[in-house]
Amino acid sequence: SPNPVPSSSSLKELIEELVNITQNQKVPLCNGSMVWSLNLTSSMYCAALDSLISISNCSVIHRTKRMLSALCPHKPSAKHVSSEYVRDTKIEVAQFLKDLLRHSRIIFRNGSYN
């Protein structure tokens, strides 16, 4: 259950990290590893973490995984999991992070930080 006045700082930190990764990408991110694409909606940080956790030995996204863990420390219960957990398409990590950045910016602008 969200607190009445959530902090935007952690979301802002995530956005800054995603900007840093996606803008400074010189070579294929995480050796071109593929992750499950998601409809990044209600539990998007949890869904994003569930997808990225499969990537090991890629230090570039270590901080991103930590930040997602901070935003979603507890796994959503089954009754709260919806379409964003449907796994049908894999995309490259770089594209996944760009999608995550885009949705995070929308949430930040809307002020619904949780």
Partner: antibody
Framework: EVQLVESGGGLVQPGGSLRLSCAAS????????MSWVRQAPGKGLEWVAS???????YYPDSVKGRFTISRDNAKNSLYLQMNSLRAEDTAVYYC????????????WGQGTLVTVSS | DIQMTQSPSSLSASVGDRVTITCKAS??????????MHWYQQKPGKAPKLLIY???NLESGVPSRFSGSGSGTDFTLTISSLQPEDFATYYC?????????FGGGTKVEIK
């Protein structure tokens, strides 16, 4: 060095209230989720409450509605407000940095003892 | 709630022994192929310390004599060669479903 220091424990009567505090240092407090875990004397560990970096809170049914976890990022502090205390709430309460469901409770404080007795 | 059953509840061993502790969950704690099971060590009067996360990943700074294995409902913590500082109580914990639950603990004592 990560440090978590709990305070606020003590003796309280059944039905009473107590507020525990945890002072965090050695890491960027705002960037981590935090939790409280308790341990009754001579017993095992029990998760009590968690709070995400964004302010979402999580509780087991045993304390829901009686305990409230909160954080003050400006003060690098975590709190646990405990109301309607019962004898079975007697325990050492640990503050822990929660690195998420994939990573567990990475760091723990030394604990503060709460005794609920008349 | 997911019940965590540890065995044995206590054991006596000597320095240099190989020690195995098991933890059984009442239902699977796997999430997308990752086991949300963690192991902690607690010494008397001290706070718990994370040893293993996600069933088999060694926490930074933890000696390599500690290892974890398992998936689904059955998990094992192994100490390959018991050292004097390893005499303590060990707990497993699942984070796959709220409420997060711990095993009852296994006390490792000196023989």
């Amino acid at each position: 060095e990560v440090q978590l220091v709990e305070s606020g424990g003590g003796l309280v009567q059944p039905g009473g209230s107590l507020r525990l505090s945890c002072a965090a240092s050695g890491f960027t407090f705002i960037s981590y989720a935090m939790s409280w875990v308790r341990q009754a004397p001579g017993k095992g560990l029990e998760w009590v409450a968690s709070i995400s970096s964004g302010g979402n809170t999580y509780y087991p049914d045993s304390v829901k509605g009686r305990f409230t976890i909160s954080r003050d990022n400006a003060k690098n502090s975590l709190y646990l407000q405990m109301n309607s205390l019962r004898a079975e709430d007697t325990a050492v309460y640990y503050c822990a940095r929660l690195d998420g469901y994939y990573f567990g409770f990475a760091y723990w404080g030394q604990g503060t003892l709460v005794t609920v007795s008349s | 709630d997911i019940q965590m059953t540890q065995s044995p509840s206590s054991l006596s061993a000597s320095v240099g022994d190989r020690v195995t502790i098991t933890c059984k969950a009442s239902e699977s704690v796997d999430n997308y192929g990752k086991s949300l099971m963690h192991w902690y060590q607690q010494k008397p009067g001290k706070a718990p310390k994370l040893l293993i996360y996600r069933a088999s990943n060694l926490e930074s700074g933890v000696p390599s004599r500690f290892s974890g294995s398992g998936s689904g409902t059955d998990f094992t913590l192994t100490i390959s060669s018991l050292q004097p500082e390893d005499f303590a109580t060990y707990y497993c914990q699942q984070s796959n479903e709220d409420p997060w639950t711990f095993g009852g603990g296994t006390k490792v004592e000196i023989k």
